[in-house]
Structures are given as structure tokens and as C-alpha cells.
């Protein structure tokens, strides 16, 4: 039929940025590349129906649905989702198509379904059929990497029981501390599950597929290092694999290391040694205390020594099952407008955490820092000073951990007004909350300093914004203010802002703000 | 429950010598490595000598030939013998054994 428009049908993948998760603009984040999505004309239907090929997307993922029409004059349209039917505003791009969105954002259960469009051009009617439905990751899992020894080898393997199956990588740094950051120039990665450089400062091992991706460090012990104040820990569950790493340099090969666990020398099979020269002729010497599968009797001091180094410890703590420590009692902060500030929730866990910090239903990355004693940190900054209620929730295989903080911004009140026949309203957001007074301007008080008691009514109400309280106060209109201007103070420790109400007859009523 | 006190600190003129001792209580003495640890007002803790089990001792660099560590096994104690005080060596001072901490015996070096 030539009268049928030409129609391209697209799926365009966002990649969520914290600025913009949660707005529902037409194009609300960065995005993919489209991916064309067909657009057949459906056999035997009656009308005309054009189906897009099925649409998967990942849980909590955001998507825009796309049409492009190339048909002559303007054209009109209806999304249908479930029998509810959603607005839709065409518009045109640079080459005169007309373009249709429908943008998913954060894609939950309830929005897998059938999107109909129904367009109406100066042509004809037609219709197009997205299905959109969640990839099943039930059967996915991403597990955090282990090591073992290679048989017969001094090497590791790195090891990751996931589904599907994980690319792994080793990632090397030969740095102390702060340039040891992922994306640093001093940190080399390598693409294989085989190991045979040990002799590194810090090597971790990191497992990613379509879940993500997670890592493990190999824990180690440096006796060049000083003693630190703080006594290293290792959190394991039972039945996990244990890897220590001793490490040693001496300017000559005459010194040895030994491990020992509680006073006791390691059994012979749960230790291996290896050395060589640097570059500067020192020997290095490092050894491996490993336990291919610990029980609660493995958990104590883990001691290694040296003859030309000062010993040095770690605890070993063996666990039944994975755990998060924190104080989970909620948190009031009051800051000024432009203050600095960060929430921090300092927490214990094992295994590792996942964790988001959420404001008013937009969910915002969360990073973690390994603190010096065993603790790990984690802080939003991006409050943008917005004031509500913030939430920090974590969780590992084993446990959860949610904890609130509410975030108060001082400043002045300002003051929005409006009325009905029978009364007038102020509201404002000010912090501390504000206090109220209304005062009556006539003749007598051109001022507006008539203070007015009669038919007030205060109240405060937590706003939309989580956690954000508006207060509000009611004047019940009588005869004696009928047809006067009043005026409606909010006031606080930081200032006073009022707006004046003409009081007249049902209409419209006049607001004159004057701060 | 494990113990650790320490003692022998005092004020003392630059030049002069101390002898601080660490005794131990409700844990086996002789199977640990013991360490000395100082902390200057304003500062972080720092290292300053460690015994070994076998009697091997070491020392943070700026205590070397001034301060020797010793072990006493049967009186469950450590000492450490300090020489040639400088003011820099003002500090509490702590000993450990593995993650126990005694109290801190305050050392004050000035003329």
C-alpha cells in the first residue's frame, strides 16, 4: 500500500547519571547508540499494525522507546499501556520525521508489558506494538573471586563461580597507597586466570559479567613496612579459601620467613616460598599461608617473621555467615545554604558490601574506602543542599543495613500565599521552621502593624520532598476582614518574609509579596 | 583476660636515660614478639623497637644505638632501656602484644 508511511522503530539503552535519574524528560541521560528494532508490518491483522522485534531490558535499567515517521503533514498520537493511555507529543527532526518517545525510566516489573502506539496521519491510521519485557537474571549470579595454586607451579589461579561465565582479569600495582587507584598509569592489568608475577606490591583479582563486576585483594603482609598501629583483619565464611601473602626485602638472600598461626609453625602443604633478585640486587622473598577450605579452628593470629625483620600480624576471624556492623540510629545534620558537608556511615562487613544512597526516589552511586582498622567509609556528598531525608542502605549475601539521616538547610522563609472565599493560606519551607503572624492593614494601621489572633490556625506537613517540612498557617476569613488587605508573616532566626492578601469577594485574589 | 602495664616513665633531662618495663598478665609471655609503640601530642602513633620470640630485636630508625629492647620470660616483661634522651623523645609510650594495648606510660624530655 503506498499510502503506508516508511517507519523505523528504535530502542535507545541510557546509561544512568546521578544528575538526571528520576527526570522525566525526553531524553533524560546519556545514551547508546539506537538499536533499530524492525518494525514489520503484522500479517493478517485487521488494520494496520506494525510490531517492533521484543524488547529485553534489564531491572532497573532506562530505556526510550522511538518511532520515526516519514509521512507526509502532522500527525497525532496515543501511547496505550495496560488499558491506561499515557500522553504523547510528537515532534519533528531535522529531516521533517516525525518522532514519538516513550521513555521507561528505572525498569521495574510493572512496566514490562505491551506499549501501543496509535498514530493518526493526514493518510492514514496505524498502530505499533513494542512488547517490552525484563531479561530473567535469576539464574545469573557473580561471585567474588578466589585463588588457588596452581598444581605443580608457583602460580595462582583466580577463580570466579558465575553465571554467565565472567571475564577474569589480575590487576597489578607496584605503588604504595593512593596511585595504586584504578585508572592510575602504575596499575597493569592482564586478561588471564593464571598468575605467575607474585612478587608485586598489591594484586587483586577482579571477575566481571552483565551483573557487574567484583574483586579480591590478595591480603598481604609487607615486613619492610613499618608496623602499623592497627592490627590487620581478615573476615572469612567457613569453607572459603584463606590466601596471606608475606613479603620481604633484604639487601642479601641470608634471611628466611616463617608463618605461624598462634605460636604453632603452618603445616607443611599450607605454606609455599618464592624469591628473586630486583633490580637493584636485593632479594625479595615472599610466602604463601593458605588453607583450601577454613573451619572456625583456623581463625587467630596469623604471625609472620623474618630474621632480619620485625615480625608482623594478622587476625584471622572465621565467621558462620556474613555480616554488616554499624550504628543504624538515624542522623539529623543542620547546615547552612552554602556549607560543606557529606554524610558518612563508617561500617565493619564481610563480605564486601553493595550499597546506594537514595534521595526522594533517585538513587545515587555509593563508593566505599577501606579505612586503616578494618573499617570502611562511605560519603555523599551530592546533596546538592537540598533539604529532606536521606537514606544509606547496604547489603552482602547475608545482611542488610539501612540508616536515615535527615538534612536540614537554614535559611529565611519564603513565602507563598494563596485563598479560597472562606480563607487565606501561607506556606513556607524556611529552617528552622518558622513562626507566624498576621497582621490587618486599614486606615487606621496603613502599616499593616493590626496584629490579628482570631481564626488562626498553624500547622506543619511533611512535603513531597522526603523528609522536608513545609510550615503552613490558616486565616478563617470573618466579617470584621472582609475586603481588607492582610499581610502573612513567616519568621525565623534568619529573617522574616511576608505576603499581603486582598481579602475581597470570591475571585481571584491579588498577592503582593514584600520582603 | 590479657593485661599489659607499663611503667618507668618520668620527666628526665635531655641526655639522660629511662628504663620503661611492660608487664604482662593472663597470657603466655614467651610465645609473642613484643612491640613499642609512642605517641607525641598532636601525632600518630609510632613505632620504636620490637623483641621477637627468639630474642631478636629491631628499631624504628630515629632510636637506633640510643634505646635496646629486652625480655624477661619468667617475669612476664619487656623493657626497654632508653639513652641519650632528646626532646623529641617526649611521648607517651605503649607497649603490644599482637592486638593488645597496655594504658601508656608518659615519658617527658626537657631541660
Known amino acids: 500500500n503506498q499510502d503506508l508511511p516508511v517507519i523505523k522503530c528504535v530502542l535507545i539503552n541510557h546509561k544512568n547519571n546521578d544528575s538526571s535519574v528520576g527526570k522525566s524528560s525526553s531524553y533524560p541521560m546519556v545514551s547508546e547508540s539506537p538499536e533499530d528494532l524492525g518494525c514489520a508490518l503484522r500479517p493478517q491483522s485487521s488494520g494496520t499494525v506494525y510490531e517492533a522485534a521484543a524488547v529485553e531490558v534489564d531491572v532497573s535499567a532506562s530505556i526510550t522507546l522511538q518511532v520515526l515517521v516519514d509521512a507526509p503533514g502532522n500527525i497525532s498520537c496515543l501511547w496505550v499501556f495496560k488499558h491506561s493511555s499515557l500522553n504523547c507529543q510528537p515532534h519533528f527532526d531535522l529531516q521533517n520525521r516525525g518522532v514519538v518517545s516513550m521513555v521507561i525510566l528505572k525498569m521495574t516489573e510493572t512496566q514490562a508489558g505491551e506499549y501501543l502506539l496509535f498514530i493518526q496521519s493526514e493518510a492514514t491510521n496505524y498502530t505499533i506494538l513494542f512488547t517490552v519485557s525484563i531479561r530473567n537474571t535469576l539464574l545469573y549470579t557473580l561471585r567474588r573471586p578466589y585463588f588457588r595454586k596452581m598444581e605443580n607451579q608457583d602460580a595462582l589461579v583466580c577463580i570466579s563461580e558465575s553465571v554467565p561465565e565472567p571475564i577474569v582479569e589480575w590487576v597489578l600495582c607496584d605503588s604504595q597507597g593512593e596511585s595504586c587507584k584504578e585508572e592510575s598509569p602504575a596499575v597493569v592489568k592482564k586478561e588471564e586466570k593464571v598468575l605467575h608475577e607474585l612478587f608485586g606490591t598489591d594484586i587483586r583479582c577482579c571477575a566481571r559479567n552483565e551483573l557487574g563486576r567484583e574483586c579480591t585483594r590478595l591480603f598481604t603482609i609487607d615486613l619492610n613496612q613499618t608496623p602499623q598501629t592497627t592490627l590487620p583483619q581478615l573476615f572469612l565464611k567457613v569453607g572459603e579459601p584463606l590466601w596471606i601473602r608475606c613479603k620481604a626485602v633484604h639487601v642479601n638472600h641470608g634471611f628466611g620467613l616463617t608463618w605461624e598461626l598462634e605460636n604453632k609453625a603452618l603445616e607443611e602443604g599450607n605454606y609455599f616460598e618464592m624469591s628473586t633478585y630486583s633490580t637493584n640486587r636485593t632479594m625479595i622473598r615472599i610466602l604463601f599461608a593458605f588453607v583450601s577450605s577454613v573451619a572456625r579452628n583456623d581463625t587467630g593470629y596469623y604471625t609472620c617473621s623474618s630474621s632480619k625483620h620485625p615480625s608482623q600480624s594478622a587476625l584471622v576471624t572465621i565467621v558462620e555467615k556474613g555480616f554488616i556492623n554499624a550504628t543504624n540510629s538515624s542522623e539529623d545534620y543542620e547546615i547552612d545554604q552554602y556549607e560543606e558537608f557529606c554524610f558518612s556511615v563508617r561500617f565493619k562487613a564481610y563480605p564486601q558490601i553493595r550499597c546506594t544512597w537514595t534521595f526522594s526516589r533517585k538513587s545515587f552511586p555509593c563508593e566505599q574506602k577501606g579505612l586503616d582498622n578494618g573499617y570502611s567509609i562511605s560519603k555523599f556528598c551530592n546533596h546538592k543542599h537540598q533539604p529532606g531525608e536521606y537514606i544509606f542502605h547496604a547489603e552482602n549475601d547475608d545482611a542488610q543495613f539501612t540508616k536515615m539521616f535527615t538534612l536540614n538547610i537554614r535559611r529565611k522563609p519564603q513565602v507563598l500565599a494563596e485563598a479560597s472565599a472562606s480563607q487565606a493560606s501561607c506556606f513556607s519551607d524556611g529552617y528552622p521552621l518558622p513562626s507566624w503572624t498576621w497582621k490587618k492593614c486599614s486606615d487606621k494601621s496603613p502599616n499593616c502593624t493590626e496584629e490579628i489572633t482570631e481564626g488562626v490556625w498553624n500547622r506543619k506537613a511533611n512535603r513531597k520532598v522526603f523528609g522536608q517540612w513545609v510550615s503552613s498557617s490558616t486565616l478563617n476569613m470573618s466579617e470584621a476582614i472582609k475586603g481588607f488587605l492582610v499581610k502573612c508573616c513567616a519568621y525565623n532566626s534568619l529573617g522574616t518574609s511576608c505576603e499581603t492578601i486582598l481579602l475581597n469577594s470570591p475571585g481571584p485574589f491579588p498577592f503582593i509579596q514584600d520582603n | 583476660q590479657v593485661q599489659l602495664q607499663e611503667s618507668g616513665g618520668g620527666l628526665v633531662q635531655p641526655g639522660g636515660s629511662l628504663r620503661l618495663s611492660c608487664a604482662a598478665s593472663?597470657?603466655?609471655?614467651?610465645?609473642?614478639?613484643i612491640d613499642w609503640y609512642r605517641q607525641a601530642p598532636g601525632n600518630e602513633r609510632e613505632w620504636v623497637a620490637q623483641?621477637?620470640?627468639?630474642?631478636?630485636?629491631f628499631y624504628a630508625d630515629s632510636v637506633k644505638g640510643r634505646f635496646a629492647i629486652s625480655r624477661d620470660n619468667a617475669k612476664n616483661t619487656v623493657y626497654l632501656q632508653m639513652n641519650s634522651l632528646k626532646p623529641e623523645d617526649t611521648a607517651v609510650y605503649y607497649c603490644?602484644?599482637?592486638?593488645?594495648w597496655g594504658q601508656g606510660t608518659q615519658v617527658t624530655v626537657s631541660s
Open positions: 603490644r602484644i599482637l592486638s593488645y
Open positions: 593472663g597470657f603466655d609471655f614467651s610465645i609473642s614478639y
Open positions: 623483641i621477637t620470640r627468639g630474642g631478636d630485636s
